[in-house]
């Protein structure tokens, strides 16, 4: 079941996945200039059995001036580069390795992909806040969001973080000084698709990745 | 010219329907996808649903979910959007949105449709 919503906007926040639950959607989307192929898959799909995730599909784009032609999809360093470096982009990640059963990581940049990514989740989703360069993080509780389903609606978990306007970046989970003993989550709430293992484990995972990969839904 | 022209907006009751239609010309709907967005005044423009073509992804805004449901014509060029159980708040102009990609929903999601429509203005009253 897809999230009806895109996870809260925090204040001089964003946000990013550490793996993709089963079922992910990402848009094929092109930069200026390019187009998605007319036969070209609309998204790319996580999909998976008990052993494996991997992303279904590939995105490709050409140029809006040559309908016909397919551009390869092995990225380029140049249009690497043109990513938004605020998102991270790790390259090296194999496509087809999951960290987590069920689950998916980043997919490898395309040629001539649109500089920010568009995310489908589904339910049971975590995603982590980290506030921008030059907000500093003040912890009430958990600095991340669960996408759940209540009563048949899917809501996402209000994460517990403010960003104040001072000189110094915040890092990622495992990394920070909280500023406060974190509480526990504000509301006490009965999921039905989310369990206390993805919460472990998600969390375990986001405090050793090394790599960090850093994406934002379309703002 | 691309033109697309929502129509069906009027003043209806709390509890009751309405049917908008979103007619699309200059462009083959069966390579876009369609969405609503809707601005009520002094707010700010708002996802409402939105359908590719391929029917692989239909979003809806959690406000809506239940009560609306976005579907469309592609040979007859045309999209739809039922409202049922309709609430004051749902009071608003609303617009048809399309695009040659993929889904694009949430908060600030209007950015990313390449043609809008002028919009029509749905009142409920309590």
């Known amino acids: 079941e897809l999230c009806d919503d895109d996870p809260p906007e925090i204040p001089h926040a964003t946000f990013k996945a550490m793996a993709y639950k089963e079922g992910t959607m990402l848009n094929c989307e092109c930069k200026r200039g390019f187009r998605r192929i007319k036969s070209g898959s609309l998204y790319m799909l996580c999909t998976g059995n008990s052993s494996h995730s991997s992303w279904d599909n590939q995105c490709q784009c050409t140029s809006s001036a040559t309908r016909n032609t397919t551009k390869q999809v092995t990225p380029q360093p140049e249009e690497q580069k043109e990513r938004k470096t605020t998102e991270m982009q790790s390259p090296m990640q194999p496509v087809d390795q999951a960290s987590l059963p069920g689950h998916c990581r980043e997919p490898p940049p395309w040629e001539n992909e649109a500089t920010e990514r568009i995310y489908h989740f589904v339910v049971g989703q975590m995603v982590y806040y980290q506030c921008v360069q030059g907000y500093r993080a003040l912890h009430r509780g958990p600095a991340e969001s669960v996408c759940k389903m209540t009563h048949g609606k899917t809501r996402w978990t209000q994460p517990q973080l403010i960003c104040t306007g001072e000189m110094e970046t915040s890092q990622f989970p495992g990394e920070e000084k909280p500023q406060a003993s974190p509480e526990g989550r504000p509301e006490s709430e009965t999921s039905c698709l989310v369990t206390t293992t993805d919460f472990q484990i998600q969390t375990e995972m986001a405090a050793t990745m090394e790599t960090s990969i850093f994406t934002t839904e379309y703002q | 010219e691309v033109q697309l022209v929502e129509s069906g907006g009027g003043l209806v009751q709390a509890g009751g329907s309405l049917g908008l239609s979103c007619a699309a010309s200059?462009?083959?709907?069966?390579?876009?996808?369609m969405a609503w967005f809707r601005q009520a005044p002094g707010k700010e423009r708002e996802f409402v649903a939105a359908?590719?073509?391929?029917?692989?992804?239909?979003r809806y805004a959690s406000s809506v979910k239940g009560r609306f449901t976005i579907s469309r014509d592609n040979a007859g060029n045309t999209g739809f959007l039922q409202m049922n159980s309709l609430r004051p708040e749902d009071t608003a102009v609303y617009y048809c949105?399309?695009?040659?990609?993929?889904?694009?929903?949430?908060?600030?999601?209007?950015?990313?449709?390449?043609?809008w429509g002028q919009g029509t203005q749905v009142t409920v009253s309590p």
């Open positions: 949105a399309a695009r040659e990609g993929g889904v694009v929903a949430g908060v600030r999601s209007g950015a990313p449709y390449d043609y």
């Open positions: 200059g462009i083959t709907f069966n390579d876009h996808t």
């Open positions: 359908r590719d073509w391929s029917d692989i992804i239909t």
